[in-house]
Interface confidence: low
């Protein structure tokens, strides 16, 4: 029985207080245990060794469970996906007891929190997904998933965070609930991947020789592993892998008097290779001596005339095109001609004389090596 008391206070003439009390004995109604524990919540704890669950009843009181199946408000040795019935009572509540149906969740190891981030996008996105890696008999409709990443909350099996900063750590906490009872949770700290490096800044890019060029640059600010330097002449492209510490590269074995377009980008090999933007520049190599003319022929067109022809050099190596023919008799230069084409008609030579014919190409800057043939005029037929 509980006592409900009502009190009234009056003052006597002497100023002392006189208290008269009326006490009524009542029997207040206790709630039923079914009512008191109507909204009881349960946490399920999984034992990986035994593969069994413990249900922790979230009550403050030391409740009594029918058949003594509770210890410290915990129900032990519950099999996954099997229902167990627990009768809950306490001296603060009356019959009927609360009959709690424990709907035991699936085994924790049957779920795996998987990083589903696409490697190509791993620099700015995070994807996390709960995977069912083994079958179970529980009703999947009763399973709900929750993620919290920073101040963002998601009620999905899979989440995708986008527009993130590269090389930053993000923490995500997740839990799985079965019939609104949490039975497993996981936390992941994921560092976004390295981002694409920035563009290198080309300081200068020039050629000071026929076969050489030089490029210097400042590296990009962001992390990178190496550089790729490509140089293109006409449709031919050659690429080099350059060490990250280089800030200058001397290009060798270039073709003279040729325009080269250079592109330089940094790259980083992270989850995938990420290429930074390419910086471009170009130069034209200096002239050089052309190669030798070839297929030179000297043929007699009459007793004292010769026809000299040759094919153009394989490499002109300069801006202009001019063919030169020098004709010597002994050590004396008797003719020196220059044509746009390698086609010379040499007339009025001495009969029965040995001549040396030297043909070469001049590109406007340099002469090439001469092609030398010896030919003799014949006796005059008349």
């Amino acid at each position: 029985a509980y006592l409900n008391a009502s009190e009234t206070t009056t003052l006597s003439p002497s100023g002392s207080a006189v208290i008269s009390t009326t006490t009524i004995a009542t029997t207040p109604s206790k709630p039923t245990c079914d009512e008191k524990y109507a909204n009881i919540t349960v946490d399920y704890l999984y034992n990986k060794e035994t593969k069994l669950f413990t249900a922790k009843l979230n009550v403050n009181e030391n409740v009594e469970c029918g058949n003594n199946t509770c210890t410290n408000n915990e129900v032990h040795n519950l099999t996954e996906c099997k229902n167990a019935s627990v009768s809950i009572s306490h001296n603060s509540c009356t019959a009927p007891d609360k009959t709690l149906i424990l709907d035991v969740p699936p085994g924790v190891e049957k779920f795996q929190l998987h990083d589903c981030t696409q490697v190509e996008k791993a620099d700015t996105t995070i994807c996390l997904k709960w995977k069912n890696i083994e079958t179970f008999t529980c009703d999947t409709q009763n399973i709900t998933y929750r993620f919290q990443c920073g101040n963002m909350i998601f009620d999905n099996k899979e989440i995708k965070l986008e527009n993130l900063e590269p090389e930053h750590e993000y923490k995500c906490d997740s839990e799985i609930l079965y019939n609104n009872h949490k039975f497993t949770n996981a936390s992941k700290i994921i560092k976004t991947d390295f981002g694409s490096p920035g563009e290198p800044q080309i300081i200068f890019c020039r050629s000071e020789a026929a076969h050489q060029g030089v490029i210097t640059w400042n590296p990009p600010q962001r992390s990178f592993h190496n550089f790729t330097l490509c140089y293109i002449k006409e449709t031919e492209k050659d690429c080099l892998n350059l060490d990250k510490n280089l800030i200058k590269y001397d290009l060798q074995n270039l073709k003279p008097y040729t325009k080269y377009v250079l592109s330089l980008h940094a790259y980083i090999i992270a989850k995938v290779q990420r290429n930074g933007s390419a910086a471009m520049c170009h130069f034209t190599t200096k002239s050089a001596p052309p190669s030798q003319v070839w297929n030179m022929t000297v043929s007699m067109t009459s007793d004292n005339s010769m026809h000299v022809k040759c094919r153009p050099p394989r490499d002109r190596n300069g801006p202009h095109e001019r063919y030169h023919l020098e004709v010597e008799a002994g050590n004396t230069l008797v003719r020196n001609e220059s044509h746009k084409n390698c086609d010379f008609r040499v007339k009025d030579l001495q009969y029965s004389t040995d001549y040396t014919f030297k043909a070469y190409f001049h590109n406007g800057d340099y002469p090439g090596e001469p092609f030398i043939l010896h030919h003799s005029t014949s006796y005059n037929s008349k």
Partner: antibody, heavy 119, light 106 residues
Framework: EVQLVESGGGLVQPGGSLRLSCAAS????????MAWIRQAPGKGLEWVAS????????YYPDSVKDRFTISRDNSKNTLYLQMNSLRAEDTAVYYC????????????WGQGTLVTVSS | DIQMTQSPSSLSASVGDRVTITCKAS??????LDWYQQKPGKAPKLLIH???NLHTGIPSRFSGSGSGTDYTLTISSLQPEDFATYYC????????FGGGTKVEIK
């Protein structure tokens, strides 16, 4: 004709030193990266050291770092490998190699010089 | 450091056979891969540079392919002079050789 001729190999005691030389001819030495590559008896090829055309960039694997020094004298068309603190596992034929592209395409190799480290 | 795994370590074949040798890198090497041939007592000889470029004077029966981490040397029709040991070399980051493949007469 491109030619690379190594010299300086021989028998040396563990902890000793040797200096290998490689005389280059038949190409413009100053234009190309060079390297030393070795081959232990009956084994595969192992890169030992590389040097850029100007000598400004040098690379070693961990196995020889701080013990071997690659250098070049472009005025003499010669490549060198100074080997200190030699160990039995350094026993090998050492080849001098010319790279056709920046860091690859070893298109010319010397005949090799044998270094034997033994007590 | 990048590791190169070359396979097989040896193989037996007959003249006229098609032979394939592979090299696998421990990370992306961006096609920076050469192939060399070595005969006993001789220095290695460059066959292919930058994955698929045939070196001057090398017969067209040799070819190379690959990208990323996986590379292949193919000899379309094995000739008597092709019995030798073959090595791959990556030069994407420092330099690493494969362990070699000895091609023997069956």
């Amino acid at each position: 004709e491109v030619q690379l001729v190594e010299s300086g190999g021989g028998l040396v005691q563990p902890g000793g030193s040797l200096r290998l030389s490689c005389a280059a001819s038949g190409f413009t030495f100053t234009n190309f990266w060079m390297a030393w590559i070795r081959q232990a008896p009956g084994k595969g090829l192992e890169w030992v050291a590389s040097i850029s055309s100007s000598g400004g960039s040098i690379y070693y694997p961990d196995s020889v770092k701080d013990r071997f020094t690659i250098s070049r004298d472009n005025s003499k068309n010669t490549l060198y490998l100074q080997m200190n603190s030699l160990r039995a596992e350094d026993t090998a034929v050492y080849y001098c190699v010319k790279f056709h592209h920046y860091s690859g395409g070893g298109d010319a190799w010397g005949q090799g010089t044998l270094v034997t480290v033994s007590s | 450091d990048i590791q190169m795994t070359q396979s097989p370590s040896s193989l037996s074949a007959s003249v006229g056979d098609r032979v394939t040798i592979t090299c696998k890198a421990s990370q992306n090497i961006n096609k920076y891969l050469d192939w060399y041939q070595q005969k006993p007592g001789k220095a290695p000889k460059l066959l292919i540079h930058y994955t698929n470029n045939l070196h001057t004077g090398i017969p067209s029966r040799f070819s190379g392919s690959g990208s990323g981490t996986d590379y292949t040397l193919t000899i379309s029709s094995l000739q008597p002079e092709d019995f030798a040991t073959y090595y791959c070399l990556q030069h994407s980051s420092r330099w690493t050789f494969g362990g070699g493949t000895k091609v023997e007469i069956k």
